[in-house]
């Protein structure tokens, strides 16, 4: 090899050992029979050398640094050449470094030809191994602007006072052009400006200078986004840290052409704007930090550019002004992550503040719109609390548990609507009366409706789930001792059509001691399956539940248990079941932890089934499933 550097070129070439590898044979640079491991060639020098091994790329790296001084004379602006040409250099991992020094008042602009650049974060690497590391200068301090790969959106980076650009090329890479040019600009009066150009839909992740370390104190950095007018941009902060400010406030400012409120100022913790049409600027402004405990300011954010969706021009009014203690959340439904670009899916408040989820609270009227390619990617969850604090006022009072029509008219599927029903302890209980009798969901007879009611205790310490119930069964009402949550959960978009089938009334009734009482009025046509609460986890310790089962005069009920034994093992107390005829009060008592369960029994009159648990040993829980079937009486036994 012969490397000759022109006298005034301000180029230095350094060949040195790379990261040490466990290669058996060492390798040397050979210059007139001398074996060395480092070679430095300066401007005006000409050196001939070879390598002592066949694969020097496994041992050595080469650095070519060009110092460009714009302080003392004119600056060589224009396309930057790779000097010396890559064809004259050994095939080693090579880094070309351009160090440009300029006056504070001079702006320098790096322009990147296609492909543009894509910023990468710490620990990331570029697929083709080609990286661009760019840093600036504040007085004597070097500031890392970022590390970039090819195939992105960054087209220009403007700085002042100097710039250092390092282009790293792997030994096998055929690239023979720098891919950028330098131009002079007037002072930019800030650390840097990064221009990001979108030709179509896409996303860009960008970071504050020095990321993940701290952004320089009291500095200003701007990103300019060039977005076709027919597309919409949304900003989301992926990661940020705030420093401890002594004076001024850390903030981001948006300049949105056409906005009457420019610049729009946001705190970093605010929801960032979305659904912006066309170009916009985003600036990060630091503060004067506390000298004793400065902390760090850093920001990593994503800009998502996509077509406006049909829904984005529609405004939906959600009137919660007459509601109390209610919150509605629109959020992404859980999905498997895919690796290809997926357009964002946002919900916007007043068309501007867009985010992937939004919570609306009662007491106000809200205007929302959607910026989303596919609204099935979102769902709604609503929570409403109905509480009674004064038992004298609430007793016998009823409330309808209905999904408000405003919510049903939204173009997003309702997932859960939860009512938290709270009563004064030991004073009142609750009764749920459905518009249509309910069926309890069991493996033997699953619900196949578009929605179900999930009923569970709302007492934090109590793990009691009464079950899942859907319209079209035999359960006429459910009485519960204390606080519960009733969740209407939808399972199919057809819920919108079936919404009329929903309807549950809750009333506050005098307090009773049993955990729950189910009133069952079986139909002659079908078998009713019933199971104890907390199925699969076992009825909680010392809990008592009853079923009030009606038998019409001309029918006989067959009560069947689906196991021979309950399987419960008591640590303390006894688990028992009482079957009591309501007319004669005659009762049978079964010890569930000892006796076998009764064989199928026939009941000519309405009867009670009461199950009371002991304190079971873990793993030996009380779970019972039974059925009631009506058949016509053949002989009148009255």
């Amino acid at each position: 090899f012969e490397i000759a550097l022109p006298r005034e070129s301000n180029i230095t070439v350094l060949i040195k050992l790379g990261t040490p590898t466990l290669l058996a044979k060492p390798c040397y640079i050979v210059i007139s029979k001398r074996h060395i491991t480092m070679l430095s060639i300066k401007s005006g020098e000409r050196i001939v050398f070879t390598f002592s091994c066949q694969s020097p790329e496994n041992h050595f790296v080469i650095e070519i640094q060009k110092n460009i001084d714009c302080m003392s004379g004119p600056c060589p602006f224009g396309e930057v050449q790779l000097q010396p040409s890559t064809s004259l250099l050994p095939t080693l991992n090579r880094t070309f470094i351009w160090d440009v020094k300029a006056h504070k008042s001079i702006g320098l602009e790096l322009q990147f030809s296609i492909p543009r650049l894509r910023q990468i974060g710490p620990g990331e690497s570029c697929p083709d191994g080609v990286t661009h590391s760019i840093s600036g200068r504040i007085d004597a301090t070097v500031v890392r602007i970022g590390t970039f790969c090819s195939n992105g959106t960054v087209s220009r980076i403007k700085m002042q006072e100097g710039v250092k650009m390092a282009l790293h090329l792997p030994w096998f890479h055929p690239r023979n052009v720098s891919g950028f040019s330098i131009a002079n600009r007037s002072s930019i009066k800030r650390l840097c400006i990064i221009e990001s150009v979108f030709e179509g839909e896409g996303s860009a992740t960008l970071m504050s200078a020095n990321y993940p370390e701290g952004f320089p104190e009291d500095e200003l950095m701007t990103w300019q986004f060039v977005v076709p007018a027919h597309l919409r941009a949304s900003v989301s902060f992926l990661n940020f840290n705030l420093s401890n400010c002594e004076r001024k406030e850390e903030r981001v400012e948006y300049y949105i052409p056409g906005s009457t409120t420019n610049p729009e100022v946001f705190k970093l913790e605010d929801k960032q704007p979305g659904n912006m049409a066309g170009n916009f600027n985003l600036s990060l402004q630091g503060c004067d930090q506390d000298a004793q405990s400065p902390g760090i300011l850093r920001l990593q954010f994503q800009v998502l550019v996509q077509h406006p969706q049909n829904e984005s021009n529609k405004i939906y009014v959600v009137d919660l002004s007459n509601e109390r203690a209610m919150s509605l959340t629109i959020e992404p439904r859980p999905v498997k992550q895919s690796r290809k670009f997926v357009p964002g899916c946002f919900v916007c408040l007043e068309s501007r503040t867009c985010s992937s989820n939004l919570t609306l609270t009662s007491g106000s009227k809200h205007k929302i719109s959607f910026l989303c390619d596919d609204l099935t990617r979102l769902w709604m969850n609503v929570e409403k609390t109905i509480s009674c604090t004064d038992h004298r006022y609430c007793q016998r009072k009823s409330y309808s548990l209905q999904v408000p029509s405003d919510i049903l008219h939204l173009p997003v599927e309702l997932h859960d609507f939860s009512w938290k029903l709270l009563v004064p302890k030991d004073r009142l209980s609750l009764v749920l009366v459905p518009a249509q009798k309910l069926q309890q969901h069991t493996h033997e007879k699953p619900c196949n409706t578009s929605f179900s009611y999930l009923v569970a205790s709302a007492i934090p310490s109590q793990d009691l789930y009464f079950g899942s119930f859907c319209p079209g069964g035999s359960i006429k009402q459910i009485q519960v001792k204390q606080n519960i949550s009733v969740t209407l959960r939808t399972f199919a978009p057809s819920f919108q059509q079936e919404a009329s089938r929903q309807g549950l009334t809750v009333s506050f009734i005098p307090y009773f001691k049993e955990e729950g009482v189910f009133t069952v009025t079986p139909d002659t046509k079908s078998k009713v399956y019933l199971r104890t609460p907390n199925w699969d986890r076992g009825l909680p310790s010392l809990t008592s539940v009853s079923w009030n089962i009606s038998v019409p005069r001309d029918q006989v009920a067959c009560l069947t248990f689906f196991k021979e034994r309950s399987g419960v093992v008591c640590q303390t107390g006894r688990a028992f079941m009482i079957i009591q005829e309501q007319r004669t009060r005659a009762e049978e008592i079964f010890s569930l932890d000892e006796d076998v369960l009764p064989k199928p029994s026939f009941h000519h009159h309405s009867f009670w089934v009461n199950i009371s648990n002991c304190s079971p040993t873990s793993g030996k829980q009380l779970d019972l499933l039974f059925s009631v079937t009506l058949t016509p009486r053949t002989v009148d036994l009255t």
Epitope: F1, T50, Q54, E57, N58, W171, F172
Partner: nanobody
Framework: QVQLVESGGGLVQAGGSLRLSCAAS????????MGWYRQAPGKQRELVVV???????NYADSVKGRFTISRDNAKNTVYLQMNSLKPEDTAVYYC?????????WGKGTQVTVSS
Amino acid sequence: QVQLVESGGGLVQAGGSLRLSCAASGSIFSGSAMGWYRQAPGKQRELVVVESSGGSTNYADSVKGRFTISRDNAKNTVYLQMNSLKPEDTAVYYCRGFYYGMGYWGKGTQVTVSS
């Protein structure tokens, strides 16, 4: 004098396969890194795949899973098996050998993929 001669190019329909060969002269071959590159009309020459002297390979994203590099040391030949070809694979394909820090190029072989 180190010489690399490519062969095996031609016209193939989209979805078809081709196998390119690169015969290397003498001592360059054994223990040297070898690679395949391509240049489409009006475009920069780009890496297809390179195999380092240690045997590790580096494929361009656009060919991963479709192209495979292999070599026969006894015949001083490196191969490029190209499957599921696409019209955008149309280019002149060059073989490159790395020897004592020098990168030697072959003269290239034309591959045309018709749709």
